[in-house]
Interface confidence: medium
């Protein structure tokens, strides 16, 4: 088979949007199966037609309704003949149109009067492509060959820039880039103390508008009264917009405020936010916990705990906790230093402990008191006898048979 491209130049140039028909003439085969190839890949296009000129002469057509840049390339046709593929001479298809932008000016945010650059690049074919710059509706530069960089010495207000690309086919306009002025950030808002303890406070806030410049840090200022002496100033990188204030004095009134900064400087401060650290939990455990056996049950008594300092605040109720080795356990809150215990099994060992609480929480537990089941069996002992045992910490918690003098601690009591 002799293959040749018939009636088509080796280089074919068409305008964008125009139809294209490539012809391929095959002579010496009765029924050729013509394949079109573009840049090495078979064209899977259904617009492929065949016309028999004679029995041994066929023309194949590849039809493109509307040429676009992506259609440009090297085309050839091929047929299989006796197991071998014969390839025609190629056609170089060039699709010409108005310039096509490969780089367009981007939006920017710049400090007032600071210099900056904008870039623009467009390609043909046809070449050459020249660039004209516009600032708003005013032509400010060019024509210059593509690619082009516009150097601007500075702006004092938000300004629009665009570029225009020209070639023999016409012109194309780029997107409009807006150059915004950077400014100081706005004050933060929703400043909240999210967690409080006696010596720490967690703070969170929402950043205000960043002034089109990345927020770099925020400052948390702490005083003991709004406008008072600065107790603490913490500078935190952001995000996240949170801060942990440490080493505060318990049960103390504070105020805090926050500001954030970008490259141009700091925002105004947000409003003062008052807060109070929590007081200290009681430092002492109730002493001399003991049990009094009565006909109606068991009365527990202990000594009153006196506050060690003003930071503990007023001491509130006592919390009593008891457990038995059958798994029964309970807690009760009592106002005084005496409690009547019910609902426990006298046949089982009983372990009791007590602590004093305030607004912050409960203080340390007292030494556990073990009331042995042997004390109750057969109503042993006078009705008002007092029996108490001090339990050494760390002794086994897994004994199930106890002598009268044995004592043990329970896992639930480990702190």
């Amino acid at each position: 088979a002799g293959l040749k491209l018939m009636g088509a130049p080796v280089k074919l140039t068409v305008s964008q949007g125009q139809p294209v028909k490539l012809n391929c003439s095959v002579e010496g085969m009765e029924e050729p199966d013509i394949q079109w190839v573009k840049d090495g890949a078979v064209v899977q296009n259904l617009d492929q037609l065949y016309i028999p000129v004679s029995e041994q002469h066929w023309i194949g057509f590849l039809s493109l309704k509307s040429a676009e840049r992506s259609d440009a390339g090297r085309y050839w046709c091929q047929v299989e003949d006796g197991g071998e593929t014969e390839i025609s001479q190629p056609v170089w298809l060039t699709v010409e149109g108005v310039p096509f932008f490969t780089v367009e000016p981007k939006d920017l945010a710049v400090p007032p009067n600071a210099p900056f650059q904008l870039s623009c690049e467009a390609v043909g074919p046809p070449e050459p492509v020249t660039i004209v710059w516009w600032r708003g509706t005013t032509k400010i530069g060019g024509p210059a060959p593509s690619p082009s960089v516009l150097n601007v010495t500075g702006v004092t207000q938000s300004t629009m820039f665009s570029c225009e690309a020209h070639n023999l086919k016409g012109l194309a306009s780029s997107r409009t880039a807006t150059v915004h002025l950077q400014a100081l950030p706005a004050a933060p808002f929703n400043v909240t103390v999210t967690k409080l303890s006696s010596s720490n406070a967690s703070v969170a806030w929402m950043p205000g508008a960043d002034g089109r410049a990345l927020l770099q840090s925020c400052t948390v200022q702490v005083t003991q009264a709004p406008g008072g002496w600065e107790v603490l100033a913490v500078v935190v990188p952001v995000p996240p917009f949170t801060c942990l204030l440490r080493d505060l004095v318990p049960a103390t009134n504070y105020s805090l405020r926050v500001r954030c900064a970008n490259a141009l400087g700091p925002s105004p401060y947000a409003d003062w936010v008052p807060f109070q650290t929590k007081g200290l939990a009681p430092a002492s455990a109730p002493q001399n916990l003991h049990a009094i056996r009565t006909d109606s049950g068991l009365i527990l008594e202990w000594e009153e705990v006196i506050p060690e300092g003003p930071l503990e605040g007023p001491l509130g109720p006592y919390k009593l906790s008891w457990v038995q080795d059958n798994g029964t356990q309970d807690e009760l809150t009592v106002e005084g230093t005496r409690a009547n215990l019910t609902g426990w099994d006298p046949q089982k060992d009983l372990i009791v402990r007590v602590c004093v609480s305030n607004a912050v929480g409960c203080g340390p537990w007292s030494q556990p008191l073990v009331v042995s089941s042997h004390d109750h069996a057969g109503q042993q002992g006078p009705p008002h006898s007092r029996t108490s045992w001090l339990v050494p910490r760390g002794s086994s918690a897994h004994h199930h048979h106890h002598h009268h003098h044995s004592a043990w601690s329970h896992p639930q009591f480990e702190k």
Epitope: D33, Q44, N45, L46, I51, P52, L64
Partner: antibody
């Protein structure tokens, strides 16, 4: 005169296999492609696929790929549409159509001018 | 998968101009074809390659294409033009063809 003669109507049960045919006459079979078009009762036309003039290359619509097979026998100038396992949703009229290809007139031919009369396939249990 | 969108129905009085549209993203690059199908009959080619009239089709039928829209125009519609009309084209890569959903033309 160009003629496309299709096989007769058929009733099948779901899961059955079926092949329908389209015999061309009045032109050189290997000058043209053959396409198949489906039309469900009361519905629109759907392009199923086509086979090239040398019966060496097939193209299918996305909805039909893997569900039907298009083939052709050049010696008898016949194109075929085949199902391995029919479903009730295959109930439809099936047309074969002569697609673009060659013309002795020497001009780019018109596509899809010649249609077979259609084969009605009913799939019902 | 690629779709061609047509209005379900168009109504005109005899002698009026009927316009049936077909929209598809690939139509700027791919030709549109139009078929007429009367009840119980096989479809008939009316327009090929956007605007070319198929042989035997009356001159009142014309086609055009602009951007993503192809249009079949029947100038001075006749009662016998009452039928379903389908547009037909390729998806962008040319790997398969697609029919539009069809438009029922009523000539009252």
């Amino acid at each position: 005169e160009v003629q496309l003669v299709q096989s007769g109507a058929d009733v099948k049960k779901p899961g059955a296999s079926l092949t329908i045919s389209c015999q061309a006459s009045g032109y050189t079979f290997t000058d043209y492609w053959i396409s198949w078009v489906r039309q469900k009762p009361g519905k629109g036309l759907e392009w199923m696929g086509q086979i090239n003039r040398h019966a060496s290359n097939t193209m299918y619509g996305p909805s039909f790929q893997g569900h039907v097979t298009i083939s052709a026998d050049r010696s008898t100038a016949t194109a075929y549409l085949q199902w391995r396992s029919l479903e009730a949703s295959d109930t439809a009229m099936y047309y074969c159509v002569r697609s673009g290809g060659a013309t002795s007139g020497g001009t780019i031919p018109e596509y899809y001018q010649h249609w077979g009369p259609g084969t009605l396939v009913t799939v019902s249990s | 998968s690629y779709e061609l969108t047509q209005p379900p129905s168009v109504s005109v009085s005899p002698g009026q101009t009927a316009r049936i549209t077909c929209s598809g993203d690939a139509l700027p690059k791919k030709y549109a074809y139009w078929y007429q199908q009367k009840s119980g009959q096989a479809p008939v080619l009316v327009i090929y390659e956007d605007w070319k009239r198929a042989s035997g089709i009356p001159e009142r039928f014309s086609g055009s294409s602009s951007g993503t829209m192809a249009t079949l125009t029947i100038s001075g519609a006749q009662v016998e033009d009452e039928a379903d009309y389908y547009c037909y084209s390729q998806e962008r890569k040319g790997n398969y063809f697609v029919f539009g959903g069809g438009t029922k033309l009523t000539v009252l």
